[in-house]
């Protein structure tokens, strides 16, 4: 079953390589268990950046070594991706799955283009 997912078209990462965006899904019914996955599409290749499953009303828990953190509020998930560099510029797609209770719903956003600009190295102060 399909579900609409909205996310911003463009986000500029901070000078510290942090990008945040909101992923919002139009839930057809109430879910108690939701999975959010961030996918990166670059050069027609799609790779999984991070994923978290959470109980509604609880915090998202990504793996300890994940570059993602997030919070949820209703049908919105606030995602933050850290440690980004210029080479990580690309389209970041939000995938939302309503896992429990059934039926299963799947929604995939159109993607957020994240631009990352590496900071200029500080000049030597002689």
């Amino acid at each position: 079953k399909a579900m609409h997912v909205a996310q911003p078209a463009v986000v500029l990462a901070s000078s510290r390589g942090i990008a945040s965006f909101v992923c919002e899904y139009a839930s057809p019914g109430k879910a108690t268990e939701v999975r959010v996955t961030v996918l990166r599409q670059a050069d027609s290749q799609v790779t999984e950046v991070c994923a978290a499953t959470y109980m509604m009303g609880n915090e998202l828990t990504f793996l300890d070594d994940s570059i993602c953190t997030g919070t949820s509020s209703g049908n919105q998930v606030n995602l933050t991706i850290q440690g980004l560099r210029a080479m990580d510029t690309g389209l970041y797609i939000c995938k939302v799955e309503l896992m429990y209770p059934p039926p299963y719903y799947l929604g995939i956003g159109n993607g957020t283009q994240i631009y990352v600009i590496d900071p200029e190295p500080c000049p030597d102060s002689d």
Epitope: T32, R35, T37, E97, Y100, P101, P102, P103, Y104, L106
Partner: antibody, heavy 118, light 111 residues
Framework: EVQLVESGGGLVQPGGSLRLSCAAS?????????WSWIRQAPGKGLEWIGD???????YYNPSLKSRVTISRDNSKNTLYLQLNSLRAEDTAVYYC???????????WGQGTLVTVSS | DIQLTQSPSSLSASVGDRVTITCRAP??????????LHWYQQKPGKAPKLLIY???NRATGIPSRFSGSGSGTDFTLTISSLQPEDFATYYC?????????FGQGTKVEIK
């Protein structure tokens, strides 16, 4: 008619790995249902291992999550179960099954027996 | 995890008897008016077979002597008139919350 046939069972050494296959016929595994692996130790009840959704997402029982991988080959219409670091308590008949929209298991394979012993 | 408790664990009955098996959950497995509780029959050496889904709906091809009822935490599988082919083990299963869990089973034996 949906038919599921498991294979790959047999005797495995403790600490080893198993890779089971489940060949589906009469229905495409990408056609909107979810597919599961369930096991049953000799004389015991049923234990859900995990699922692969039609979207390709996988979902595992937390009690086995660190040791299990479920995958599929769409071109062969086949599901796979990989279980690592096997121990005696993994001895069981392993079934694959199809989940309906409300997560009842409406079609089952005949099962394949895995025995973990030295 | 939602641990389902079936009772009795086993029972002896005769052909023609009415048999009732119960399945109890520690919390409700209902959501928006639907019960995520299913029943299976398993015969020795065979895979389980879906009998009843969503607490009260008979699966395709299941005889009308099998019926399911209940909601919330308490569910019942009833065989109105036991037939020789009904001697088997019966399991309930919840799909309300992950991980999916099964009851420990009820073995129906010939008296």
């Amino acid at each position: 008619e949906v038919q599921l046939v498991e294979s790959g069972g047999g005797l495995v050494q403790p600490g080893g790995s198993l890779r089971l296959s489940c060949a589906a016929s009469g229905y495409s595994i990408t056609s909107g249902h979810h597919w599961s692996w369930i096991r049953q130790a000799p004389g015991k009840g049923l234990e859900w291992i995990g699922d692969i959704y039609h979207s390709g997402s996988t979902y595992y029982n937390p009690s086995l999550k660190s040791r299990v991988t479920i995958s599929r080959d769409n071109s062969k219409n086949t599901l796979y179960l990989q279980l690592n670091s096997l121990r005696a308590e993994d001895t069981a008949v392993y079934y694959c099954a199809r989940k309906d929209d409300y997560y009842a298991f409406d079609y089952w394979g005949q099962g394949t027996l895995v025995t973990v012993s030295s | 995890d939602i641990q389902l408790t079936q009772s009795p664990s086993s029972l002896s009955a005769s052909v023609g008897d009415r048999v009732t098996i119960t399945c109890r959950a520690p919390q409700s497995v209902d959501f928006h008016g639907k019960s995520f509780l299913h029943w299976y029959q398993q015969k020795p050496g065979k895979a389980p077979k879906l009998l009843i889904y969503d607490a009260s709906n008979r699966a395709t091809g299941i005889p009308s002597r099998f019926s399911g009822s209940g909601s919330g935490t308490d569910f019942t599988l009833t065989i109105s008139s036991l037939q020789p082919e009904d001697f088997a083990t019966y399991y309930c299963q919840q799909s309300y919350r992950s991980p999916i869990t099964f009851g420990q089973g009820t073995k129906v034996e010939i008296k």
